[in-house]
C-alpha cells in the first residue's frame, strides 16, 4: 500500500491580504437561497467555497474560484502565468488523483503528470488532495506547460453518472423591476467595484414581500426594491447604508473630476 | 449490520510495535462506499484520529502528522479486515484504539465503531 | 491543523430543561451543497462513541428528534430540545473539512 504524497502547502502565516475584505469572515447571509460563492479563508490563504443566502453578506464573496483567487491573493495572476510559461509548477500539481473519502460525484480536473495534461476525474467531495481544480482552465493556467499541450484534452465522458454537485438557485427568473435609464450611464469599464453591484436587482423566487435595496449603476444611487424572500442575486441589501458602502466605493469617475468615494 | 470486531494485546513493551486488528462483517474493507480507520483515545489528548485507509480505483491511505513516521494500516481482502501497525511505542501512546468505518455515501462520518481496545505500554 | 474548541467541558443538565453545546473550529469549515463538513458525536458510558449528527445538520438513523445541530463559517452548535436520562456522556464534534480529522476535547454532560 504506498503512501500518497502529501498536501505541499507552503507556510504562509505572515501573508497579508490584498484587501481588508478578504480578511472577513465567509458570512452566508439571513437569506434561505443555495448560491454556490467562494470566499477567501485567511487561516488556510485560500479561496474555498460556501454557500451563500442570497442577501447580506459580506464583500469576501465571489462567484467565481478565479475571481476570488486574483482578488485576494497576492502575486496569483504572476504565479499564474509563472506556471503557464513552464517556469514553475507549484507541488500539488504532481499529486496523484485523489477522489477523496467521500463519494459526492464532483466533476474536477487533475494535472497528470504522465500525460502532461489536465484531466477530468471525479472527486468525492472531501478530502481530496491539492490537484483538484474547479475548471479545466484553472488546472492549465496553474500546472498545465503549454509547450505540452497543443492536442486537446482527452475526457472520459462521464456525465452519464457525474452531476455538477452545484445546488445553484435559478437567476434566470424575468427581473420585474424597471430600471430607469440615464443619459448620465457608466459604461462598465468604469465601475471597479463589486461585479454583483452591476446586476439588475432581482426579487427572486418566493412569495414573501421584503423591503431590500439594490445599487443602481446607471444613478450611482441604492434603490429600494420588494424581495421575495430567495434566489436572486447579490445586488441586494438589507439597508440603503449596507449598499452603498458596498458598491459606492467602486464607480469611478473621469480622471478629471476626481473618484467618488 | 456492519460490526467491527478489534483484537491485539492490551499490553506492549516500550520501543515494541502495536499490532491491532479489525475484522469487518456487512460491509467489505474493498468498498468503494467506505473508509477504514483508527482512533484512539486517551485521558491526556481525547479522541485522535491516527489514518485512514479506502479503496476506490486504487488504495490510498492518509495518517496524521503527529504519527506518520510510525503508523502503517493495512487491508487484508483475504480475510475483510485491517490492521493498524505502530513501531517505537512510548507509555505516550497508551490509550484506547478504535477501529471505525468511515460512510462515504450518506453519513460523511464515522456511523460505526468497533468496541476499543486499551493498550498499555508499559515495561 | 483545525483546532475544534467546545464549550461547556461540562453541563450539567435538568430533565426535561433544554441543553446546548457550542463547537468553534480554528478556520472556517467548507459548505458544499448545502452542508457543513462537521459531525457530531456521543459516547455513552463504558461505550464506543455513536454518531449523532453528520453534515452539520442531519440526525443519523435512531437519533431522536429532540437533537439538532446548526451553525456555518467557525461557529457550531448540538442543542438538545429536553434532556433525557439516556442522554448523559461525552458529546464531540468534529471536522472533515481537511487532514488531520481532528475532534473537539468533549462536553460532559450529566444530570443534575
Known amino acids: 500500500l504506498s503512501e500518497e504524497a502529501d498536501d505541499t502547502d507552503s507556510e504562509l502565516g505572515s501573508m497579508k491580504p490584498l484587501h481588508t475584505f478578504c480578511a472577513m469572515k465567509a458570512d452566508d447571509g439571513p437569506c434561505k437561497a443555495m448560491i454556490r460563492s467562494y470566499f477567501f479563508n485567511m487561516y488556510t490563504h485560500q479561496c474555498e467555497e460556501f454557500i451563500y443566502g442570497g442577501c447580506e453578506g459580506n464583500e469576501n464573496r465571489f462567484d467565481t474560484l478565479e475571481e476570488c483567487k486574483k482578488t485576494c491573493i497576492p502575486g496569483y495572476e504572476k504565479t499564474a502565468v509563472k506556471a503557464a510559461s513552464g517556469a514553475e509548477r507549484p507541488d500539488f500539481c504532481f499529486l496523484e488523483e485523489d477522489p477523496g473519502l467521500c463519494r459526492g460525484y464532483m466533476k474536477r480536473y487533475l494535472y497528470n503528470n504522465q500525460t502532461k495534461q489536465c484531466e477530468r476525474f471525479v472527486y468525492g467531495g472531501c478530502l481530496g488532495n491539492r490537484n483538484n481544480f474547479e475548471t479545466l482552465d484553472e488546472c492549465k493556467k496553474i500546472c498545465e506547460n503549454p509547450v505540452h499541450s497543443p492536442s486537446p484534452v482527452n475526457e472520459v465522458q462521464m456525465s452519464d453518472y457525474v452531476t455538477d454537485g452545484n445546488t445553484v438557485t435559478d437567476r434566470s427568473t424575468v427581473n420585474n423591476i424597471v430600471v430607469p435609464q440615464s443619459p448620465k450611464v457608466p459604461r462598465r469599464r468604469d465601475y471597479r467595484g463589486r461585479p454583483w453591484c452591476l446586476q439588475p436587482a432581482d426579487s427572486g423566487l418566493c412569495k414573501a414581500s421584503e423591503r431590500r435595496f439594490y445599487y443602481n449603476s446607471a444613478t450611482g444611487k441604492c434603490h429600494r426594491f420588494n424581495y421575495t424572500g430567495c434566489g436572486g442575486n447579490n445586488n441586494n441589501f438589507t439597508t440603503r447604508r449596507r449598499c452603498l458602502r458596498s458598491c459606492k466605493t467602486g464607480l469611478i469617475k473621469n480622471k478629471s473630476k476626481g473618484v467618488v468615494k | 449490520q456492519v460490526q467491527l470486531q478489534q483484537s491485539g494485546p492490551g499490553l506492549v513493551k516500550p520501543s515494541q510495535t502495536l499490532s491491532l486488528t479489525c475484522a469487518i462483517s456487512?460491509?467489505?474493507?474493498?468498498?468503494?462506499?467506505?473508509?477504514w480507520s483508527w482512533i484512539r483515545q486517551s485521558p491526556g489528548r481525547g479522541l485522535e484520529w491516527l489514518g485512514i485507509?479506502?479503496?476506490?480505483?486504487?488504495?490510498?491511505?492518509r495518517y496524521a502528522v503527529s504519527v506518520k513516521s510510525r503508523i502503517t494500516i493495512n487491508p487484508d481482502t483475504s480475510k475483510n479486515q485491517f490492521s493498524l501497525q505502530l513501531n517505537s511505542v512510548t507509555p505516550e501512546d497508551t490509550a484506547v484504539y478504535y477501529c471505525?468505518?468511515?460512510?462515504?455515501?450518506?453519513?460523511?462520518?464515522?456511523?460505526?465503531w468497533g468496541q476499543g481496545t486499551l493498550v498499555t505500554v508499559s515495561s | 491543523d483545525i483546532v475544534m474548541t467546545q464549550s461547556p467541558l461540562s453541563l450539567p443538565v435538568t430533565p426535561g430543561e433544554p441543553a446546548s453545546i457550542s463547537c468553534r473550529s480554528s478556520?472556517?469549515?467548507?459548505?458544499?451543497?448545502?452542508?457543513?463538513?462537521l459531525n457530531w458525536y456521543l459516547q455513552k458510558p463504558g461505550q464506543s462513541p455513536q454518531l449523532l449528527i453528520y453534515?452539520?445538520?442531519n440526525r443519523a438513523s435512531g437519533v431522536p428528534d429532540r437533537f439538532s445541530g446548526s451553525g456555518s463559517g467557525t461557529d457550531f452548535t448540538l442543542k438538545i430540545s429536553r434532556v433525557e436520562a439516556e442522554d448523559v456522556g461525552v458529546y464531540y464534534c468534529?471536522?472533515?473539512?481537511?487532514?488531520?480529522?481532528?475532534f473537539g476535547q468533549g462536553t460532559k454532560v450529566e444530570i443534575k
Open positions: 456487512g460491509d467489505s474493507v474493498s468498498s468503494d462506499s467506505a473508509a
Open positions: 453534515k452539520g445538520s
Open positions: 485507509i479506502y479503496k476506490r480505483s486504487k488504495w490510498y491511505n
Open positions: 468534529q471536522q472533515y473539512d481537511s487532514y488531520p480529522l481532528t
Open positions: 478556520q472556517s469549515l467548507v459548505i458544499s451543497r448545502g452542508n457543513t463538513y
Open positions: 471505525a468505518r468511515w460512510d462515504s455515501d450518506k453519513h460523511w462520518g464515522f456511523d460505526y
